[in-house]
Interface confidence: low
């Protein structure tokens, strides 16, 4: 089964994926790939974490949550119709065949011609002063210039609160449907 998530062209898409570290900082490698989860690893890897860091990513793919607490949800910036499809979040738990695999279906809708003043569901637009990521062409530059004087703990707390409310809203608004 796969869970379906929706975003509009030009928005940031959010694909949730979580695990509970055995102990704080005791991280498990995670990979995100485009395409359904294969038997091992991730196909077409777009982002990867290891036991310590986010150590690989490609343009427009970010972890905005606190991956050190097990929030490895993927944000895809400024989506296009080509971003539609299945994404694999693979939590690489040590041991034979222990991996947790999640297939998430991303459906991209064309942007509305007249944007309505609806509730903002995009993390970075909802809190532009908290954490803003911007792509700047091939250099894949990220700017955190609008970050106020708050520490990582505050960021993760805000992110967790936002994530929890967003997940609830997404389910309530039928943004996610279990297949």
């Amino acid at each position: 089964s796969e869970v379906e998530y929706r975003a509009e062209v030009g928005q940031n898409a959010y694909l949730p994926c979580f695990y509970t570290p055995a102990a704080p900082g005791n991280l498990v490698p995670v990979c995100w790939g485009k395409g359904a989860c294969p038997v091992f690893e991730c196909g077409n890897v777009v982002l990867r974490t290891d036991e310590r860091d986010v150590n690989y990513w490609t343009s427009r793919y970010w972890l905005n949550g606190d991956f050190r607490k097990g929030d490895v949800s993927l944000t895809i910036e400024n989506v296009t119709l080509a971003d539609s499809g299945i994404y694999c979040c693979r939590i690489q738990i040590p041991g034979i065949m222990n991996d947790e695999k999640f297939n998430l279906k991303l459906v991209i809708k064309p942007a509305k011609v007249t944007p309505a003043p609806t509730r903002q569901r995009d993390f970075t637009a909802a809190f532009p002063r908290m954490l803003t990521t911007r792509g700047h062409g091939p250099a894949e530059t990220q700017t955190l210039g609008s970050l106020p004087d708050i520490n990582l703990t505050q960021i993760s707390t805000l992110a967790n609160e936002l994530r929890d409310s967003r997940l609830a809203n997404d389910l309530r608004d039928s943004g996610a449907t279990i297949r």
Partner: antibody, heavy 114, light 110 residues
Framework: QVQLVQSGAEVKKPGSSVKVSCKAS????????IYWVRQAPGQGLEWMGS????????NYAQKFQGRVTITADESTSTAYMELSSLRSEDTAVYYC???????WGQGTLVTVSS | QAVVTQEPSLTVSPGGTVTLTCASS?????????PNWFQQRPGQAPRALIY???NRHSWTPARFSGSLLGGKAALTLSGVQPEDEADYYC?????????FGGGTKLTVLG
């Protein structure tokens, strides 16, 4: 567009240490991994280690473990690579790179000679 | 630590096609190793060409393509130009560490 500007060439004695800096200009690099790569004269590229400035944690290649320290100062958008117990075979151009290895500094030549 | 092996040197005629490969001492290279390819001309810093096996950067000419071939990562240059003469390096990811291949010196005849 972000550019990485490295410190100038250094000449060091065997057994000493060197600290090379890598400053990001035109943007911040806080959430990007900064990689350090070296290249000895006429030789290939060698990955030394990396750091994500906003987290402050570094990864090191096994070969350099215990001899290299990679740090970052977010306030100045600068990453540093310090290599200790230098020997002649550490003579190389040292590069910093960022944004999935798409942005590279100009390189810093470190010469180790008695 | 893993060893990544490339052909030390290859020669190609202008307009021809050449394939550079990248093998891992740990076994077959898969997309999980997120193969990257770089070009380096004398006196210059490396320039990224391909990421995650087969994805070209926006500045990478279409004549460069990446793939997996017989358990190795591969970089194919089609319609080789004189300016493609350079050193080429692959880079593989091994759970927490990156390892470069030894590099391939590509010579374009003429």
């Amino acid at each position: 567009q972000v550019q990485l500007v490295q410190s100038g060439a250094e000449v060091k004695k065997p057994g000493s240490s060197v600290k090379v800096s890598c400053k990001a200009s035109g943007g911040t690099f806080s959430s990007y991994t900064i990689y350090w790569v070296r290249q000895a004269p006429g030789q290939g590229l060698e990955w030394m280690g990396s750091i994500i400035p906003i987290l402050g944690t570094a990864n090191y290649a096994q070969k350099f473990q215990g001899r290299v320290t990679i740090t970052a100062d977010e306030s100045t958008s600068t990453a540093y690579m310090e290599l200790s117990s230098l020997r002649s075979e550490d003579t190389a151009v040292y590069y910093c790179a960022s944004a999935s290895h798409t942005i590279w500094g100009q390189g810093t030549l470190v010469t180790v000679s008695s | 630590q893993a060893v990544v092996t490339q052909e030390p040197s290859l020669t190609v005629s202008p307009g021809g096609t050449v394939t550079l490969t990248c093998a891992s001492s740990t076994g077959a290279v898969t997309s999980g190793y997120t193969p990257n390819w770089f070009q380096q001309r004398p006196g210059q810093a490396p320039r990224a060409l391909i990421y995650t096996t087969s994805n070209r950067h926006s500045w990478t000419p279409a004549r460069f393509s990446g793939s997996l071939l017989g358990g190795k990562a591969a970089l194919t240059l089609s319609g080789v130009q004189p300016e493609d003469e350079a050193d080429y390096y692959c880079l593989l990811y091994y759970g927490g560490a990156w390892v470069f291949g030894g590099g391939t010196k590509l010579t374009v005849l003429g």
